[in-house]
Interface confidence: medium
């Protein structure tokens, strides 16, 4: 049993729309090989310490191996682009999971970047986020179309959005849908409309293909174009992609490197 | 505007089988996110869970009155129906439906209907 | 089946009075849920996720908690907040309620 896109991330009940200062927003510039060798290792010590995670994952995985098997039959499984592995789909099909993962998941993304510490020493899902990451550039690169206009409904609370001109980030990984009413229907507290240059369709990844869904990443930024906050209906915020900005990159392999040799801690 | 009404007999005699409907109006039943059930309150008492069902057809029910229950969906009609078999004066109650939001073990009910009370007497 | 044991069952307090209500699980729970039932009408959702006010709920409600303790606390009571509440969890099937506190007016 599965979840239905647009609505994966519930935020507190009134929250600002700003830049995120305390998401973890790594995009691994450079150490994609390294991140990749780690993984294992880093994988096995994280379902150690997170049934959430671990629990998940095998249900991902069990699903894939699914899909796998009667791909050919069924057309189950887009072909999937140079480089993507079968962790990518898992950690895809993990995220879209009707289960607390997401919403764990995405929680302790928007405190992990608090501070470089509590990324490395507080934070149990740093494989999940290296996956989804690398998933969504893999996943952007294979496709023909640059940006894309999408759609998010929030359930749960109401946006308190800076004002027309603002330079906002979603704070987590963001889903969203081609589909316009597939969002308006879940979207009963705020409804985004975003052109998004850096989400990238999951559809053939997702437990849910029909909801057309596009994950956003959290490094992407957008300008606020306009905001309406109706007594009645939802608030609508109306977003557009300016660019990207992270405050950490590859954070677990310097500090892997650190144990090693003389290193360099410092953020880019 | 997410609304949920239970409809069904208000009396039954013990014995029977209780059916009731909860037509829903504002979401989608095969929003797969989304969920309904049904909840049951004796007078004075407080809330006991029934039985679910989510747009995948996947359903679960009370373990102490599983044999009596049965849960089933009609989409296109909006519908989610509960039968309760072998009914007692003990299941005299009102009985609620509610839209659960999020999944199998971490779910909550967002929304309910306004109730419906049955008694169940000869 | 995981059962929620809320305390008090009763509670008389007055208006403007600070309010704690307890529920504790008989096994550890992720989250827990909170709702208000006044007499003759269907529970409303008050608190999600332990500690999310629900739409249009006021500030003086909040939850805390984590494990197998949580609270619902109302930091200074009104007159329209006096009623019945329920916790509810749904960390394992089957999802379960507590019995209910009643609050009352002393």
């Known amino acids: 049993q599965s979840y239905s896109i647009s609505q994966l991330d519930i935020f507190s009940q009134e929250t600002p729309l700003d830049m995120a200062p305390a998401s973890f927003d790594d995009q691994y510039a450079g150490c994609l090989a390294d991140m990749t060798a780690a993984l294992p290792d880093l994988n096995h010590s994280e379902f150690q310490a997170n049934k959430v995670y671990a629990d998940g994952w095998a249900q991902a995985n069990n699903q894939w191996q699914e899909r796998r098997a009667w791909g050919s039959v069924w057309g189950s499984l887009p072909p999937s682009p140079p480089g993507f592995r079968d962790e990518h789909g898992v950690a895809l099909l993990a995220y879209t999971a009707n289960s607390p993962l997401h919403k764990e998941f995405n929680a302790a993304v928007r405190e992990a970047g608090r501070s470089r510490a509590h990324y490395l020493h507080h934070f149990s899902f740093k494989t999940l986020h290296f996956l989804l990451t690398e998933a969504l550039q893999l996943l952007r690169s294979h496709r023909s179309r640059g940006c894309q206009q999408v759609y998010r409904g929030v359930h749960g609370l109401r946006f308190r959005p800076a004002g027309p001109g603002a330079t906002v980030r979603l704070g987590g990984f963001a889903s969203a849908s081609l589909k316009n009413v597939a969002a308006q229907q879940f979207g009963e507290d705020t409804f985004f409309g975003i052109w998004t240059c850096l989400g990238a369709p999951i559809r053939g990844y997702s437990f849910f293909p029909e909801e057309e869904e596009v994950l956003i990443p959290p490094f992407e930024t957008f300008q606020v174009i306009n905001t309406s906050r109706p007594t009645q209906g939802p608030a609508r915020i109306y977003l557009r992609a300016l660019g990207k900005r992270s405050t950490y990159n590859c954070e677990y392999i310097k500090e892997k490197k650190c144990r090693s040799g003389p290193c360099w801690l410092g953020s880019s | 505007q997410v609304t949920l009404k239970e409809s069904g007999p208000v009396l039954v005699k013990p014995t029977e089988t209780l059916t009731l409907t909860c037509t829903v109006s504002?979401?989608?039943?095969?929003?797969?996110?989304?969920?309904v059930s049904w909840i049951r309150q004796p007078p004075g008492k407080a809330l006991e869970w029934l039985a679910h069902?989510?747009?995948?057809?996947?359903?679960s029910y009370s373990t102490s009155l599983k044999s009596r229950l049965t849960i089933s969906k009609d989409t296109s009609k909006s519908q989610v129906v509960l039968t309760m078999t072998n009914m007692d004066p003990v299941d005299t109650a009102t009985y609620y439906c509610?839209?659960?939001?999020?999944?199998?073990?971490?779910?909550?009910?967002?929304?309910w209907g306004q109730g419906t009370l049955v008694t169940v007497s000869s | 089946d995981i059962q929620l044991t809320q305390s008090p069952s009763f509670l008389s307090a007055s208006v403007g009075d600070r309010v704690t209500i307890t529920c504790r699980a008989s096994?550890?729970?992720?989250?827990m849920h909170w709702y208000q039932q006044k007499p003759g009408t269907s529970p409303k959702r008050l608190i999600y996720?332990?500690?999310k006010l629900a739409s249009g709920v006021p500030s003086r409600f909040s939850g805390s908690g984590s494990g197998t303790e949580y609270t619902l606390t109302i930091s200074s009571l009104q007159p329209e907040d006096f009623a019945t509440y329920y916790c509810?969890?749904?960390?394992?099937?089957?999802?379960?309620f507590g019995q209910g506190t009643k609050l009352e007016i002393k």
């Open positions: 509610a839209r659960i939001y999020g999944g199998d073990s971490w779910g909550y009910f967002d929304n």
């Open positions: 504002g979401f989608s039943l095969s929003n797969a996110r989304m969920g």
């Open positions: 069902i989510f747009s995948n057809d996947e359903k």
């Open positions: 096994s550890s729970v992720s989250y």
């Open positions: 996720d332990t500690s």
């Open positions: 509810q969890q749904w960390s394992s099937n089957p999802p379960t």
